[in-house]
Interface confidence: low
């Protein structure tokens, strides 16, 4: 998916008042400086690709997160804010209707979560002194 | 491991041409926005050029306006420039320059290629 | 067109700090990147957005922006770091990328 004709700014307000604040539950009781970002994205529409990759690709070690409250409100602020996004994503939306409760956060998902956090920084990074 | 490759560099009479490419490997070029910038012999650094991510928009250095055209091919990962209607102040070292590419382009310069050298001479 | 104005030299002696300054109008106003760059090599970026340094670069190297003034501070400088260092801004009015005229660093 192109995420190129998103609306920035109404994602960036999904994110700002809640998204972050189920990443920040999600890793409580981790510090802050416990990992290092190796993913890192250089404009919204890429940021937003390796976002939606993190959140809904399982990947070795951590194939639970697409079931998390964070990543429920992500895919729903995608599929209001990205024209066409939710049609390239049905195949994913039968995986979530079996959501349950996490069992066990493994240190892999929460390195991982940790490096969405720092995508979604990017993501926001604010617009520093243009004029 | 992340790179640019210069190369296309040469010795040019005066009011020829001639086209620099550069190869990226090792990021996700597509998203990056990417610069041309030059340094005579013995000299400072001098920006020549710049094309968005997406080829939407280029940038050039007044210096070379009308004579220089910077393009990308996102396929293939390759940035290219065209130099016409060459000088001999034009002789240098050009390389080939990533930059992050947010709202405008006031991003730094994070990765950059060894150059390849440009000599305009009769 | 905005012009950036560096020191075209500046020495000091190892162990003590080393300040390079790039005047700009209202250079506080923009974000201010630096570059360090040893002879017969490509620049290397070591301060970026007026004081963030990448990962690799060691924590001497700190930067500083306001006013007419931003300034790139290198303490217990090392014979290491004996190389040209370059300014850089947007220039959104003429959106141009510019470069100050660069300063070499000198350890003695």
């Known amino acids: 998916y192109d995420f190129t004709n998103c609306d920035f700014e109404k994602i960036k307000a999904a994110y700002l008042s809640t998204i972050s604040k189920d990443l920040i539950t999600y890793m409580s009781g981790t510090k802050s400086t416990e990992f290092n970002n190796t993913v890192s994205c250089s404009n919204r529409p890429h940021c937003l690709t390796e976002i939606q990759s993190l959140t809904f690709n399982p990947t070795a070690g951590c194939a639970s997160l697409a079931k998390e409250m964070f990543a429920m409100k992500t895919k729903a602020a995608l599929a209001i804010w990205c024209p066409g996004y939710s049609e390239t994503q049905i195949n994913a939306t039968q995986a979530m209707k079996k959501r349950r409760k996490r069992k066990v956060t493994t240190n892999k998902c929460l390195e991982q979560v940790s490096q969405l956090q720092g995508l979604w920084r990017r993501f926001n990074r604010p617009l520093l002194k243009q004029q | 491991q992340m790179q640019l490759v210069e190369s296309g560099g040469g010795v040019v009479q005066p009011g020829r041409s001639l086209r620099l490419s550069c190869a990226a490997s090792g990021f996700a070029f597509r998203t990056y926005g990417m610069h041309w910038v030059r340094q005579a012999p013995g000299k400072g650094l001098e920006w020549v050029a710049v094309?968005?991510?997406?080829?939407?928009?280029?940038h050039y250095a007044d210096s070379v306006k009308g004579r220089f055209t910077i393009t990308r091919d996102n396929s293939k990962n390759t940035l290219n420039l065209q130099m016409n209607s060459l000088r001999a102040e034009d002789t240098a070292v050009y390389y080939c320059?990533?930059?992050?590419?947010?709202?405008?382009?006031?991003?730094?310069?994070?990765?950059w290629g060894q150059g390849t050298m440009v000599t305009v001479s009769s | 067109s905005y012009v950036l104005t560096q020191p075209p030299s500046v020495s000091v002696a190892p162990g003590q700090t080393a300040r390079i300054t790039c005047g700009g109008n209202?250079?506080?106003?923009?974000?201010v990147h630096w570059y360090q760059q040893k002879p017969g090599q490509a620049p290397v970026l070591v301060v970026y957005d007026d004081s963030d340094r990448p990962s690799r670069i060691p924590e001497r190297f700190s930067g500083s922006n306001s006013g007419n003034t931003a300034t790139l501070t290198i303490s217990r400088v090392e014979a290491g770091d004996e190389a040209d260092y370059y300014c850089?801004?947007?220039?959104?009015?003429?959106?141009?990328?510019?470069f100050g005229g660069g300063t070499k660093l000198t350890v003695l």
């Open positions: 094309i968005w991510y997406d080829g939407s928009n280029t």
């Open positions: 320059v990533r930059a992050p590419q947010w709202y405008l382009s006031a991003e730094a310069f994070d990765l």
């Open positions: 850089q801004v947007w220039d959104y009015s003429s959106n141009h990328v510019v």
């Open positions: 209202l250079i506080g106003s923009k974000l």
